[in-house]
Interface confidence: low
């Protein structure tokens, strides 16, 4: 017991009080057990279980006995402590689950309810596919799903572990932003370790951001406590929430959370496909039924909003499928590994001068043909994971293949005496993997009736919960408004961000002779008067904007200088600061042909007479640096005519590219763009550079870039992006789409080698597409990394566009 707490006080009349008593007084709230600060009689008075959690016919009208867990006496309704099935068993009412679905047009709440309360019913390890078990196993959950708003699945954040995800649900922040980067983590500044089972987790210093209960409290909205000590039975948690709902107006919270450790506990033990999983799922459903019957008994079933949500899924994993680092490294005793479904490596000794992350990565990269993990420096992880920008994330990260584990050495893996594993399921893998997806259902007056919505990410829920409670969200990683389609009425109406820098529209300003690029093609142009003709074309806007910017010109959301450059086949927003386009947009029809590039054009570029020589790149920089080459944002292979091909070789279409990366980029441009255009009846492509040297997921300022690329006149991008848009209905061509849009985006790491792909020595057709799928991304990720705003001019509503921007194409099979 804590020396500060006098536990001799009593919990009489104080069970599950909402105000946490401070030392030296003992506590009676639902977390006092975790803090070992409960009053001596907490168990006796607050955790009663006598006669169980249900009324039976013989209990109806019983004489009140205060020892009972819940009551079936005539006065229990008035006193707000009936068992949840009292009216069903004793008064002939129907169970909530047996009533028909009803559309709740407006919340019907008893007197004094200022807003519909929100109950967040969170379940640990609820894999999305469990919902397929349907009403035979989970009738209550199935009714919530079919009568309310649901998605086929909800995407957790990486790593797909409990603490990072529960806290993301509460804050709308990625783990790198809120600080809970794992169930276990080491903070080098605190020189302390956070564990699920240790006391350190109670220290506020680990928890960043603003969780929903604080947002609510700061804005004068009462919040019930969100956490439950594991010893408190689920039924008691439900009864407590129901009792809180009967409190006087000035005491009653508006938001409540329930948490179930199941089905995670059973999922680990039996695996997600074990027949033993049926019972824990029935148990959870029974608790949902108790909640809904209890709400109906209080006449709150058409008042409250209920969110039924999981933290992550569950995969079939056993200890027989474990990769041991001792098979790759000689010095595993010098490292600390956070093991399991992901690996995080740091030196065992602080300030170890010999510890070399790059050397360790070299020893772990592509060493075995059947290797089941891939090592990354954290800044090289796919940007969609948002898992780098925190000192608690170790420099070396191992992405582990689904169904596998990683450990330091065989001795680190515990087995039963029989040699069998202690577990058959686990989670933590890449958050786009099917088995890691979890459940979302919204039910109540504010959610739409009988509505299925596309999958979305759990970072988006904090904003929705704020909307449900009439709160202004704290800054977070969600895109407010992107889930407006879940709600019957929207209190928040998103607005497009203001364009900060408007572009210049330069005409032909300079002479051919003004330029000395050091690699010009113009001496190859025959006849010579054709040169003037080619340059004059650059002044012609024509209908390029309508053809190549199908969704409006991207807006630049920071102060800079850039030019709009029109061409027959593409359009660019050319940066006078970075000496390359911020974006290049082009539309490729289904019929487009891929043509070859004449030899004489393959190693030279043309000056662009619209842009000052001082704002143009110079080939000398590339000639002097053998490690660097250049590529083109608009692919010359897709030029519509021999004349138009010359536009593709303008210096203003040129970007610095490592030779290794050019293999990826050229295959994408030459093969994949055409493939997508054929499959999707044409596509619009917007590509450009990304600068994220400090790996914070945000656009680097000019000054920040200068810190990292000293002495180079041309800043080298850390990544290149591409946004590929078509009509969702492939019968309509991309440029004549009047229905919803379909988008797939990529953020490709710009690296001097292709070692991420172990078979990169083979033909590009064998590995490039896989690499791109690994680095799939949301448009929103690209917007943050570029400070650009896309899709500004469409016939679709702005919330619909935000939904599109937050979509992630996972390339996974159906759930």
């Amino acid at each position: 017991d804590s020396p500060w707490t006098n536990i001799s006080g009593s919990c009489k009349g104080r069970c599950f009080e909402l105000q946490e008593a401070g030392p030296p007084d003992c506590r009676c709230d639902n977390l006092c057990k975790s803090y070992t600060s409960c009053c001596h009689d907490f168990d006796e008075l607050c955790l009663k279980t006598a006669r169980g959690w249900e009324c039976t016919k013989d209990r109806c009208g019983e004489v009140r006995n205060e020892e009972n867990a819940c009551h079936c006496s005539e006065d229990c309704l008035a006193r707000g402590d009936c068992c949840t099935n009292y009216q069903v068993v004793c008064k002939g009412e129907s169970h909530w689950v047996d009533d028909d679905c009803e559309e709740i047009k407006a919340a019907e709440c008893p007197a004094g309810f200022v807003r519909p309360p929100l109950i967040i019913f969170s379940v640990d390890g609820f894999r999305a596919s469990y919902m397929k078990k349907g009403s035979k196993v989970m009738p209550n959950i199935e009714k919530l799903r079919s009568c309310g708003t649901h998605s086929p699945y909800m995407r957790p954040v990486y790593p797909t572990k409990t603490f990072p995800n529960l806290y993301t649900l509460a804050t709308g922040l990625y783990p790198e932003s809120h600080g809970i980067v794992g169930n276990s983590m080491y903070d080098p500044v605190f020189d302390a370790t956070f564990h699920l089972r240790g006391r350190e987790k109670f220290n506020h210093r680990w928890w960043g951001g603003q969780p929903l209960w604080i947002t609510a409290t700061k804005q004068g909205v009462k919040a019930g406590t969100f956490f439950w000590s594991v010893v408190i039975p689920h039924e008691r948690r439900i009864l407590t929430i129901l009792q809180w709902l009967t409190l006087p107006d000035h005491e009653r919270p508006s938001v409540y959370a329930f948490y179930s450790e199941q089905p995670d506990f059973s999922g680990h033990k039996y695996g997600p496909f074990g027949p033993e999983m049926t019972n824990p799922l029935r148990e959870i459903d029974k608790i949902v039924g108790q909640l809904m019957d209890g709400l109906k008994q209080l006449k709150l079933h058409r008042c409250v909003n209920v969110i039924f949500v999981g933290d992550h899924g569950m995969e079939d994993v056993t200890c027989d499928r474990t990769e041991f680092l001792s098979n790759y490294l000689t010095n595993v005793d010098d490292i600390t590994l956070v093991p399991g479904t992901l690996g995080r490596i740091r030196s065992k000794f602080s300030n170890n001068a010999k510890y070399d992350p790059k050397a360790i990565i070299a020893n772990l990269t592509c060493k075995k043909p059947d290797q089941h993990f891939k090592p990354y420096l954290k800044q090289h992880l796919p940007k969609r994971l948002h898992y780098a920008n925190n000192r608690r994330i170790e420099d070396i990260h191992l992405l582990v293949e689904r169904r596998w584990h990683v450990a330091r050495k065989p001795l680190d893996v515990y087995k039963k005496p029989s040699g069998k594993c202690f577990f058959q399921g686990d989670h933590g893998f890449d958050n786009k993997v099917n088995s890691m997806q979890t459940v979302f259902v919204g039910y109540g007056s504010t959610f739409k009736y009988k509505t299925k919505v596309p999958p979305f990410e759990n970072i988006e829920l904090y904003n929705v919960m704020c909307d449900l409670l009439g709160l202004k969200p704290a800054p977070n990683n969600g895109t407010h408004g992107s889930l407006n389609h879940l709600l019957r009425t929207n209190t928040f109406r998103p607005t497009m961000p203001e364009e900060v820098t408007r572009p210049n529209y330069p005409g032909i300003m300079y002479l051919q002779s003004d330029f000395d690029l050091g690699c010009t093609c113009d001496d190859k142009v025959e006849p010579k008067n054709k040169l003037d003709e080619l340059n004059k074309r650059l002044h012609t806007k024509g209908s390029t904007e309508e053809r190549h910017l199908l969704y409006g010109r991207p807006a630049v959301l920071y102060r800079t200088r850039y030019d709009i450059l029109y061409h027959t086949d593409f359009e660019s927003g050319y940066s006078e600061i970075f000496l390359m386009p911020l974006w290049t947009s082009y539309t490729v029809s289904k019929q487009a042909e891929v043509s070859s590039v004449p030899d004489h054009l393959t190693s030279c570029v043309r000056p662009d007479v619209r842009v000052s020589p001082s704002f143009s790149q110079n080939c000398l920089a590339y000639k002097n640096d053998k490690q660097m080459s250049y590529g083109f944002l608009f692919p010359p292979y897709l030029s519509s005519s021999p004349e138009a091909k010359y536009d593709a070789f303008l210096v203003t279409n040129m970007v610095p590219m490592y030779p290794a990366f050019k293999r990826v980029w050229n295959y994408f441009q030459r093969v994949l763009v055409k493939k997508y255009a054929s499959e999707r009846n044409g596509v619009n492509v917007i590509s450009g550079p990304i600068f994220d040297y400090d790996y914070d997921g945000l656009h680097d300022t000019e000054d920040k870039i200068k810190q990292y690329v000293e002495g180079s006149s041309i800043p080298v991008p850390t990544h290149y992006y591409s946004i590929i848009t078509s009509c969702l209905d492939f019968t309509q061509p991309a440029d004549k789409c009047d229905g919803p849009l379909s988008v797939s985006s990529f953020i490709l790491p710009h690296r001097p080698d292709n070692e991420e792909s172990c078979n990169s020595s083979e033909d590009e057709s064998k590995w490039v597409e896989e690499l791109m799928k690994m680095h799939t991304a949301r448009v929103r990720d690209i917007e943050h990394l570029t400070s650009l705003d896309f899709f500004r001019k469409t016939s679709r509503s702005y919330p619909e566009i935000l939904t599109l921007k937050t979509y992630l194409h996972t390339y996974e099979s159906e759930i």
């Epitope: 309704l77 009803e102 047009k105 407006a106 019907e108 807003r115 006449k299 058409r302 209190t491």
Partner: antibody, heavy 116, light 107 residues
């Protein structure tokens, strides 16, 4: 379809008692609140009170507390508004409506005239 | 109790004109506000609920806006059948209350 049908017009003398009714159909009567609204001649709408027929839970506006009684008989899906002693100032049109957050369904109204 | 004040009391307009009716609450009602139309001898009809949502079957010329204490009902182009009395009603505080009404009459 949801319907609320009210009893016919009434002419009464001051001091007399009266009970008017509102019969609900086309929905689960016991699980929706029913409200009563008064409209005096040439005046606006006034919210009187509400009842949940499932368990007869009743709420009144302070202005009408003790002046009227709201009740319901769930066996015949009917809600009632009654006066034990009418006054001339009770002359008005009375509407029943469902539910009470937003009144999306209304009865046709019952005109009560109290005159000596 | 929450008092709702509607303005103006009377609005004289011609068919085809735009009507803007205001409803102000004595304290915040969030977005829990409805608008009704009542014609002589008829029961009120729900037009807008939750401040800005059109009820089933209500023409698009009716729109609601606002939250907190200030709300507006707009009829973009008056039709002959729109001349009536309009009431706002809050469902945020107890007791539920109505505004005193705005009469929209033909000029």
């Amino acid at each position: 379809e949801v319907q609320l049908v009210q009893s016919g017009a009434e002419v009464k003398k001051p001091g007399e008692s009266l009970k008017i009714s509102c019969k609900g159909s086309g929905y689960s009567f016991t699980s929706y609140w029913i409200g009563w609204v008064r409209q005096m001649p040439g005046k606006g709408l006034e919210w009187m009170g509400i009842i949940y027929p499932g368990d007869s839970d009743t709420r009144y506006s302070p202005s009408f507390q003790g002046q009227v009684t709201i009740s319901a008989d769930k066996s015949i899906s009917t809600a009632y508004l009654q006066w034990s002693s009418l006054k001339a100032s009770d002359t008005a049109m009375y509407y029943c409506a469902r539910p009470y957050g937003t009144f999306d369904y209304w009865g046709q109204g019952t005109l009560v005239t109290v005159s000596s | 109790e929450i008092v709702l004040t509607q303005s103006p009391a009377t609005l004289s307009l011609s068919p085809g004109e735009r009507a803007t009716l205001s409803c102000r609450a004595s304290q915040s009602v969030a977005d829990s506000l409805a608008w009704y139309q009542q014609k002589p001898g008829q029961a009120p009809r729900l037009l807008i609920y939750k401040a800005s949502n059109r009820a089933t079957g209500i023409p698009a010329r009716f729109s609601g806006s606002g939250s907190g204490t200030d709300f507006t009902l707009t009829i973009s182009s008056l039709e002959p059948e729109d001349f009536a009395v309009y009431y706002c009603q809050q469902s945020n505080g107890w007791p539920r209350t109505f505004g005193q009404g705005t009469k929209v009459e033909i000029k």
